[in-house]
């Protein structure tokens, strides 16, 4: 009689999964850009702001060609986990000035969480190594002042914007190799 009929396709092919991950990343990039602009309108930034606890930018656009799939996804996941932690911290400890960025900041957090899950699923489907996330860093200290919270928000949204921009380019390049 031959083999029994196989199961219907229950989930997207990893290539389709990568497509939808790119779409989600682009959407998150647009949200971040919009939120950063909103922050600049309300609290103009006086120059660049950094936060030592933020990850360093993973890769220059010029070096993208040499990327390997596992390295990109692992690094991207680690960096986005760090940004998720910083966004959660900002919502909790950012002070009353940053309440004006709600509910957008909450939406950003939810989408960041969704993107992280999508990346993990993609790594599972491809059977790529998934190293454990770095051990939890010590809790972030609350900003020393209201202005400290605003400067931290500028740094977090600016860094996240650059990371997501790099992520879209990297994921699109990787799609050609899958």
């Amino acid at each position: 009689p031959g083999p029994p009929p196989g199961p219907p396709r229950v989930s997207p092919d990893p290539r389709a999964e990568l497509d939808s991950t790119v779409l989600l990343t682009r959407s998150l990039l647009a949200d971040t850009r919009q939120l950063a602009a909103q922050l600049r309108d309300k609290f103009p930034a006086d120059g660049d702001h950094n936060l030592d606890s933020l990850p360093t930018l993973a890769m220059s656009a010029g070096a993208l060609g040499a990327l390997q799939l596992p390295g990109v996804l692992t690094r991207l996941r680690a960096d986005l986990l760090s940004y998720l932690r910083h966004v959660q911290w900002l919502r909790r400890a950012g002070g009353s000035s940053l309440k004006t960025l709600e509910p957008e900041l909450g939406t950003l957090q939810a989408r960041l969480d969704r993107l992280l899950r999508r990346l993990q699923l993609l790594m599972s489907r491809l059977a790529l190594p998934q190293p454990p996330p770095d051990p939890p860093a010590p809790p972030l200290a609350p900003p020393s002042s209201a202005w400290g919270g605003i400067r931290a928000a500028h740094a977090i949204l600016g860094g996240l914007h650059l990371t997501l921009d790099w992520a879209v380019r990297g994921l699109l390049l990787l799609k050609t190799r899958l």
Partner: antibody
């Protein structure tokens, strides 16, 4: 529709070898990581081995490390498991599975007995 | 001894809601790795029921739902039916293996 069809199981003596195959169809085989998972009679599922979509990463459960070898041929849409130095405790139904695993074959029975 | 712990059995009457727990550790579920659930009907191969903690593959009824919190996860089945009688397994990635680990399985009986 997705199909995973295992073959190569059977009765083998302790210390013997077997090679299992899994023929895949209905999906883009070369885009999926592939697993072997086994189930001893009346017991639960035990993950055995995984190979990445392009064959560059291979990992094994401690219980089979050094005895089993996973491989794939993307041009033939086929997954393999070479099993050497078989033991009575390797007796199980061996399933090949794709992705998370999202898709599973019907399994092939391997019996190790003298 | 499975890395993920499930109750060996669960039961319910038709129409009832039952939940099956799956407890891991800080190195798998607690490290942020997603949980997947499988249903194995008697004499058949396992079938993916829930992936990424709470996502349902196409074709799986919405009576089945999943959740995750901390180092554990659970599968809920509402409006229990006789055809739900099966073994249910949870699984999560384990970075020390670079592969999934399975729970010991829960045999669900519909009374």
């Amino acid at each position: 529709e997705v199909q995973l069809l295992e073959s190569g199981g059977g009765l083998v003596q302790p210390g013997g070898s077997l090679r299992l195959s899994c023929a895949a169809s209905g999906f883009t085989f070369s885009s999926y990581g592939m697993h072997w998972v086994r189930q001893a009679p009346g017991k639960g599922l035990e993950w055995v081995s995984v190979i990445s979509y392009d064959g560059s990463y291979k990992y094994y459960a401690d219980s089979v490390k050094g005895r089993f070898t996973i491989s794939r041929d993307n041009s033939k849409n086929t997954l393999y498991l070479q099993m050497n130095s078989l033991r009575a405790e390797d007796t199980a139904v061996y399933y090949c599975a794709a992705g998370v695993p999202d898709y599973w074959g019907q399994g092939t029975l391997v019996t190790v007995s003298s | 001894q499975s890395v993920l712990t499930q109750p060996p059995s669960a039961s319910g009457t038709p129409g009832q809601r039952v939940t099956i727990s799956c407890t891991g550790s800080s190195s798998n579920i607690g490290a942020g790795y997603d949980v997947h659930w499988y249903q194995q009907l008697p004499g058949t191969a396992p079938k993916l029921l829930i992936y990424s903690n709470n996502e349902r593959p196409s074709g799986v009824p919405d009576r089945f739902s999943g959740s995750k919190s901390g180092t554990s996860a659970s599968l809920a089945i509402s409006g229990l039916r006789s055809e739900d009688e099966a073994d249910y397994y949870c699984a999560a990635w384990d970075p020390s293996l670079n592969g999934p680990v399975f729970g010991g399985g829960t045999k669900l009986t519909v009374l």
